[in-house]
Interface confidence: low
């Protein structure tokens, strides 16, 4: 594939990455799939500076990010090391709360209204943010 050197239309460039901010809501898995079909991934927050950038664009709205623990340990969708990386959880979060009555715990992370993170039921229809890195070799989508 060819190298991507500028962001697609309607995407926002910041620090050699491109970001797309949804204005509708989807379950986490559907949001994840949407980003993948765009040759991108749900946003992976690696610094306080990136956190502030995303927070500025999403405003005080629950928004999915590319962080989940559906297989056990918390993992970023692009393989970034969770344990040693940037975190911005709300106090007492993540708590894997079962009291919501929807079955199971809370396995997907989202930005809350103040930007700090919470774990929630992955089926909730929140907005989402896709991210893709500039200068990475863009891959042709598979023929279905």
């Amino acid at each position: 594939g060819s190298e991507r050197t500028c962001c697609p239309v309607n995407w926002v460039e910041h620090e050699r990455s491109c970001y797309w901010f949804s204005r509708s809501g989807k379950a986490w898995a559907d949001a994840d799939n949407y980003c993948r079909l765009e040759d991108a991934h749900l946003v992976v927050v690696t610094s306080w500076e990136e956190q502030k950038f995303v927070q500025h664009h999403i405003g005080p709205v629950n928004t999915w990010m590319g962080l989940h623990d559906q297989n056990g340990p918390w993992k970023w969708v692009d393989g970034t090391d969770y344990e040693t990386g940037f975190k911005n959880w709300r106090p007492e979060q993540p708590d894997d709360w079962y009291g919501h009555g929807l079955g199971g715990g809370e396995d997907c992370a989202h930005f809350t209204d103040d930007g700090r993170w919470n774990d929630d039921v992955c089926q909730r229809p929140y907005r989402w943010v896709c991210e893709t890195e500039l200068d990475k070799a863009s891959q042709e989508p598979p023929l279905l």
């Epitope: 297989n71 340990p73 344990e83 040693t84 993540p94």
Partner: antibody, heavy 115, light 107 residues
């Protein structure tokens, strides 16, 4: 420098109990998940249990579920493994290790279960 | 549970040789794979995480590659201090599992 020091191992009879401790230093203990891993004499490595930084999440290998309990005291920078109903097959060196990818390990403490 | 296999189980090589150890997972684990070095009387040493990321302080002669189910650990130029047993570990999902190990010694 990250340091992990295990203690509490020893000889115990089958059916007995032991409590292992791991003293951590050199990092912000409460920010990291922790694990117990064991190695039976002459054998390979076996993951035993994990606990998240806030203690919200705990996980166990099937071989120890219901018998072992992992816990931590972030104020004391300490990790624990309470081992009950011990069996001969639990004989091993027990290591504490940091994070899912086990980036730092202690030297281990030997647990021998024998009558 | 995810099963991890390693090959070979042991190998003998000469100083300066390029050595590759193979690790396979029974299902896709993306890049959630780590490699460790075990030496008698020493704490286990983490070499690689994320399949290919070198831990700080680990010599660059060690490298990791692979994704999905097939992974490699390569020592570009074997030295006497590399005599050890090497293990791979998946941390994609619980229970975490290890390969059976590869013992490296000298001819």
């Amino acid at each position: 420098e990250v340091q992990l020091v295990e203690s509490g191992g020893g000889l115990v009879k089958p059916g007995g109990s032991l409590r292992l401790s791991c003293a951590a230093s050199g990092f912000t203990f409460s920010s990291y998940s922790m694990n117990w891993v064991r190695q039976a004499p002459g054998k390979g490595l076996e993951w035993v249990s994990s606990i998240s930084g806030s203690s919200s999440y705990t996980y166990y290998a099937d071989s120890v579920k219901g018998r072992f309990t992992i816990s931590r005291d972030n104020a004391k920078n300490s990790l624990y493994l309470q081992m009950n109903s011990l069996r001969a097959e639990d004989t091993a060196v027990y290591y504490c290790a940091r994070v899912a990818a086990l980036d730092s390990w202690g030297q281990g403490t030997l647990v021998t279960v024998s009558s | 549970d995810i099963q991890m296999t390693q090959s070979p189980s042991s190998l003998s090589a000469s100083v300066g040789d390029r050595v590759t150890i193979i690790c396979r997972a029974s299902q896709d684990i993306s890049n959630y794979l780590a490699w460790f070095q075990e030496k008698p009387g020493k704490a286990h040493k983490s070499l690689i995480y994320g399949a290919s990321s070198l831990r700080s302080g680990v010599p660059s002669k060690f490298s990791g590659s692979g994704s999905g189910t097939d992974f490699n650990l390569t020592i570009s130029s074997l030295q006497p201090e590399d005599l050890a047993t090497y293990y791979c570990q998946q941390y994609h999902s619980y229970p975490f599992t290890f390969g059976p190990g590869t013992k490296v010694d000298f001819k």
